[in-house]
């Protein structure tokens, strides 16, 4: 149904291969990505309330598809912090500002704290962000690919149950 207004291949916005999305726009797409549909010559990405399309061979298109497939996009970001309210109720917001700033080896806070008992409430540094909601934004200076975790999709359980069940108290302390 390519070209159909109502079908899965209808495009709200078409991005030309000649002018790929900016880093900022890509991050916005990553954050709001809900689904994709492979059409004949292009791929349609369904976002929260709109859609965008790009050529099947465009690198940014392949990157976003990979991002959704591997559960690293969409609700993945909000999923990470969704449970901080009851995992770390006494903790201030967590900052992403220092992510990867000085060292190439990345051992996130949840790993540094992984030996703590589930009843303990570690206090993390006060961050520069004002709300949990803002934590859902990826680092806007980098483009990375790899998957998704949508609240109703693969690994929905990871977003909803795993902090308590699977990764202990540190599972969602997702930045240092």
């Amino acid at each position: 149904n390519e070209g159909s207004v109502t079908g899965s291949c209808y495009c709200g916005k078409r991005i030309s291969s000649d002018s790929p999305p900016s880093v900022q726009f890509m991050n916005r797409l990553r954050k709001h990505l809900r689904a994709y549909h492979r059409c004949l010559y292009y791929t349609r990405f369904q976002l929260l309330s709109w859609s965008v399309c790009g050529g099947n061979k465009d690198p940014w298109v392949q990157e976003l598809m990979s991002c959704l497939d591997l559960k690293e996009c969409g609700h993945a970001y909000s999923g990470i912090v969704a449970h901080q309210k009851h995992l770390l109720p006494t903790s201030p917001p967590i900052s992403q500002a220092s992510e990867g700033a000085s060292s190439d080896i990345h051992t996130p806070a949840q790993m540094l704290l992984s030996t703590l008992q589930s009843t303990q409430r570690p206090t993390l540094p006060v961050g520069s962000l004002s709300s949990d909601k803002e934590l859902t934004r990826p680092n806007e200076t980098t483009i990375h690919t790899a998957g998704h975790s949508l609240a109703a999709g693969p690994e929905a359980g990871e977003n909803q149950k795993q902090p308590e069940k699977n990764a202990g108290p540190t599972a969602r302390t997702s930045a240092t």
Epitope: S66, D69, L70, A76, A146, P154, N166, R172
Partner: antibody, heavy 118, light 113 residues
């Protein structure tokens, strides 16, 4: 060609520590979701741990059986992952496989054997 | 956790036969966001690491002979090996990667009759 090479396994006593490593090549490492899976002698496959990518702040997940004892980390600049295993138990004896989940499939290394015995 | 139930646990075959291994998940592995099933099939021979045969339930890994066919969707999946050869004797595992923790079937041991 995709390659995952584990190292660092060996014989340790209960309650001791061991750090195993995995060197990756042949794919875009920073985009891959990395996991450790183990297999006790003569048994089936058991997932151990997972680490996400940088946009998700390298969030980690652990099997209940290793939670609080194992620590998973990654170094994207070196295409390496590490599994720090503390307070080892005899039931941790297994072949430990490093796996890379990409959109082109799930790649496995040859494994490194960890034996915990008094 | 998603429970993966694999059957049969062992299978005795003769060369040239067609074999079917079943795998059932306790919840659907089909994601509506990309219409993909998060299921993989592996072959493991003694002393070797698992070898990926099929991913996304039906996509054959590069280099895997086309006699290995993955099918199914939702909760019911099948690995079909047509014209079994001696080198196919191994243990076969299904695995879901829809949710953390990843979980595996108990394995199907393919033996020579």
């Amino acid at each position: 060609a995709v390659q995952l090479v584990e190292s660092g396994g060996g014989l340790v006593q209960p309650k001791e520590s061991l750090k195993i490593s995995c060197a990756a090549s042949g794919f875009t490492f920073s985009n891959a979701v990395m996991n450790w899976v183990r297999q006790a002698p003569g048994k089936g496959l058991e997932w151990v741990a997972r680490i996400r990518t940088k946009p998700n702040n390298y969030a980690t997940f652990y099997a209940d059986s290793v939670k609080g004892r194992f620590t998973f980390s990654r170094d994207d600049s070196k295409s390496m992952v590490y599994l720090q295993m503390d307070n080892l138990k005899t039931e941790d004896t297994a072949m430990y496989y490093c796996t890379a989940w990409t959109t082109e499939g799930i790649y496995w290394g040859q494994g490194t054997l960890v034996t915990v015995s008094a | 956790d998603i429970v993966m139930t694999q059957s049969p646990s062992s299978l005795a075959v003769s060369a040239g036969e067609t074999v079917t291994i079943n795998c059932k998940s306790s919840q659907s592995l089909l994601y509506s966001g990309n219409q993909k099933n998060y299921l993989a099939w592996y072959q493991q021979k003694p002393g070797q690491s698992p070898k990926l045969l099929i991913y996304w339930a039906s996509t054959r890994q590069s280099g895997v002979p086309d006699r290995f066919i993955g099918s199914g969707s939702g909760t019911d999946f099948t690995l079909t090996i047509s014209s079994v050869q001696a080198e196919d004797l191994a243990i076969y595992y299904c695995q879901q990667y829809y949710d953390t923790p990843w979980t595996f079937g108990g394995g199907t041991k393919l033996e020579l009759k």
